[in-house]
């Protein structure tokens, strides 16, 4: 489908003139940031951003690639080098340490420098690195964590935890030796390491004693509490603050976010990760956009500002399954959350960053026709005289042989939300990829986000912009609308 107006050079010249005019007018906001928001698309490499842009555009009855995402409107962009100290291709634990704490670490370790060793409890102490969220709290700001995964998962844990093993969600996931040596599970650290004002996501089962039935799935024993220490961490957290409230469904969340007596809010909406957006029950579970809005309503009450981490965490899971439909619909919801946050905040006093922790071996190619479905077949056939899709993976469970050969694919299959795109190499799980990811920035000091940077630079930009440690002598004018 070719839009007639695009056949005329004037169309492109006019569009470029507008973009050039806007670029010439762009002025850095030189004040300090009152608020910090980091949106983390887990596994959202550039190919995912492009494919999500087309999907979102097509959901709006447009052709696709020309329709900007919310993140596309951010004026400053950089590339982030995502390698960890020990791996060319990182995981979400090492990367979270980099962009949230400002120091690169090792694969599968969280909130620790690279002097710590994976799974070795005794290498924890002395190697802790402090997150920007922790520093924001010390400066009197309200802080929050929002995710579609478990709140104890690697990315959000980078904001509050220090652990040599990202899988130590509750004490039941830890070896006895590590417990005896004094290492703490991530759920325990969530409630005890620092005072977090808003915690929204999944992960109920790690907070309650083993065998405690789940409120949503009381007859499904696999969803019961897992804690061996018999603790009720939710109760412990509630006891710390007069205005604390715990919710586990969408209705309760909406009520709590509008209640002025609620100062601290924990919402855990699934025993583990939250459901994919395409499987979500909208009566029971909030969307990422709704959780983001609820968090912003609470955090915005603090005159000293806030720090908010928002993760679209299941983009990554869709890709690991080689199910691009899941990954891309998660990415579209992630962008919707960015859009909503932009409506609820001002770029004059809020530094907003959007980035990914790492990419995936997800490719988008094969010359599909403009306007055609992102999940469709490529025009023509492959050398084996079989159809193939525009979306593919370098490795993963999408590798299948049928009678010793690559199976043909029909449009009925490729358009299904359950379809696994084909892969070149068979693996149980598709892997992360090592190429640089984008960092989009808007707001005070966003102009510092430029060029090609280490991923750890991101945390330093946030800390500097808000005059947090170690940049308390930042020498920036106070945020717009404030007096100091």
């Amino acid at each position: 489908i070719i839009p007639v107006e695009e056949e005329n050079p004037d169309f492109w010249n006019r569009q470029a003139a507008e973009a050039l005019g806007a670029a010439k007018k762009l002025q850095p906001i030189q004040t300090a940031a009152k608020n910090l928001i980091i949106f983390l698309g887990d596994g959202m490499g550039v190919s995912t951003v492009t494919a999500a842009r087309i999907l979102k555009g097509q959901k709006e009855d447009k052709l696709g690639p020309e329709t900007p995402l919310a993140m596309d409107h951010f004026p400053y962009v950089a590339l982030s080098k995502t390698y960890s100290v020990d791996k060319h291709v990182p995981d979400s634990a090492a990367t979270a340490t980099a962009y949230l704490c400002g120091v690169k670490g090792n694969f599968q370790t969280i909130g620790l420098s690279a002097a710590a060793r994976y799974n070795q409890c005794n290498t924890t102490r002395g190697n802790e690195v402090v997150s920007v969220m922790n520093r924001a709290k010390k400066a009197g700001k309200s802080v929050g964590v929002v995710t579609t995964t478990r709140v104890q998962h690697a990315s959000p844990a980078g904001a509050y935890a220090h652990t040599v093993n990202r899988n130590w969600y509750s004490d039941a996931n830890m070896p006895g030796s590590a417990r005896r040596e004094g290492c703490k599970d991530i759920a325990t650290q969530l409630i005890s390491n620092m005072d977090i004002d808003v915690i929204l996501g999944g992960g109920r089962k790690y907070m309650f004693r083993m065998g405690a039935p789940d409120p949503e799935y009381p007859h499904d024993y696999s969803q019961d509490g897992t804690r061996m220490d018999g603790k009720n961490l939710v109760q412990e957290w509630l006891a710390k603050q007069q205005g604390a409230r715990y919710v586990w469904n969408r209705t309760e969340l909406m009520q709590a976010s509008l209640d002025p007596s609620v100062t601290h809010l924990m919402g855990l909406f699934e025993p583990g990760d939250m459901k994919y957006e395409i499987h979500r029950d909208p009566t029971l579970d909030p969307s990422l956009m709704e959780m983001t809005e609820a968090a912003l309503r609470l955090l915005s009450r603090n005159p000293r500002g806030f720090f908010l981490f928002v993760e679209g965490g299941r983009i990554d899971h869709g890709h690991h399954e080689s199910r691009a439909y899941r990954a891309l619909t998660e990415a579209v919801m992630f962008d919707d959350a960015i859009e909503r946050a932009g409506q609820l905040t001002s770029e004059e006093d809020t530094l907003t960053l959007v980035t990914a922790d790492h990419s995936h071996v997800f490719s988008f190619g094969a010359y599909p026709l403009r306007g055609s479905s992102i999940f469709g077949l490529a025009p023509g056939k492959a050398q084996d005289r079989k159809a193939y899709t525009a979306l593919l993976y370098g490795n993963g469970p999408g590798y299948v042989l049928k009678d010793g050969a690559r199976p043909d694919v029909t449009e009925s299959e490729s358009g299904s939300p359950e379809y696994r795109q084909q892969a070149a190499v068979p693996l149980d799980e598709e892997t992360h990829a090592g190429e640089d990811v984008a960092v989009f920035a808007r707001g005070p000091q966003a102009h510092l986000v430029h060029g090609v940077q280490e991923q750890s630079f991101i945390a330093h930009v946030m800390a500097f912009a808000a005059c947090l440690e170690p940049y308390t002598a930042c020498d920036l004018a106070p945020p717009a609308g404030t007096t100091d």
Epitope: I1, Q58, D61, G371, S373, F375, G376, T410, E411, G415
Partner: nanobody, 126 residues
Framework: QVQLVESGGGLVQAGASLTLSCAAS????????IVWFRQAPGKEREAVSC????????YYGDSVQGRFSSSTDNAKNTVSLQMNSLKPEDTAVYTC???????????????????WGEGTMVTVSS
């Protein structure tokens, strides 16, 4: 193999209702929108309606707006066109088509369709 098969046409009185059905196979509504066209004897082909699952949208031509309504049954992979308050000028061969696009962008242009059904005749007598 993509196939579109229409059914439900026939002869009705002016003011009556009729429902046409388009059974689609070889693709899902996640990858293509479905457009109904009609062609009256001696007249140009006219786009009647478009329905897109991806965009969650439906569009109608000016001449049928408010009288015709399109819906999908995703389980059966069918699209229905409910036609109410039929007029003699609605007499035509009605054909469903699958667009290149998953949404209704450019839906009224026949060249943007990739697959076509055979058509079903609707006659409205006065």
């Amino acid at each position: 193999q993509v196939q579109l098969v229409e059914s439900g046409g026939g002869l009705v009185q002016a003011g009556a209702s009729l429902t046409l059905s388009c059974a689609a196979s070889g693709f899902t509504f996640n990858t293509r929108s479905i457009v109904w066209f009609r062609q009256a004897p001696g007249k140009e082909r006219e786009a009647v309606s478009c329905i897109s699952k991806v965009a969650g949208s439906t569009y109608y031509g000016d001449s049928v707006q408010g009288r015709f309504s399109s819906s999908t049954d995703n389980a059966k992979n069918t699209v229905s066109l409910q036609m109410n308050s039929l007029k003699p000028e609605d007499t035509a061969v009605y054909t469903c088509a699958a667009s290149f696009a998953p949404n209704c962008y450019g839906w009224s242009v026949a060249a943007n369709m990739e697959y076509w059904g055979e058509g079903t005749m609707v006659t409205v007598s006065s």
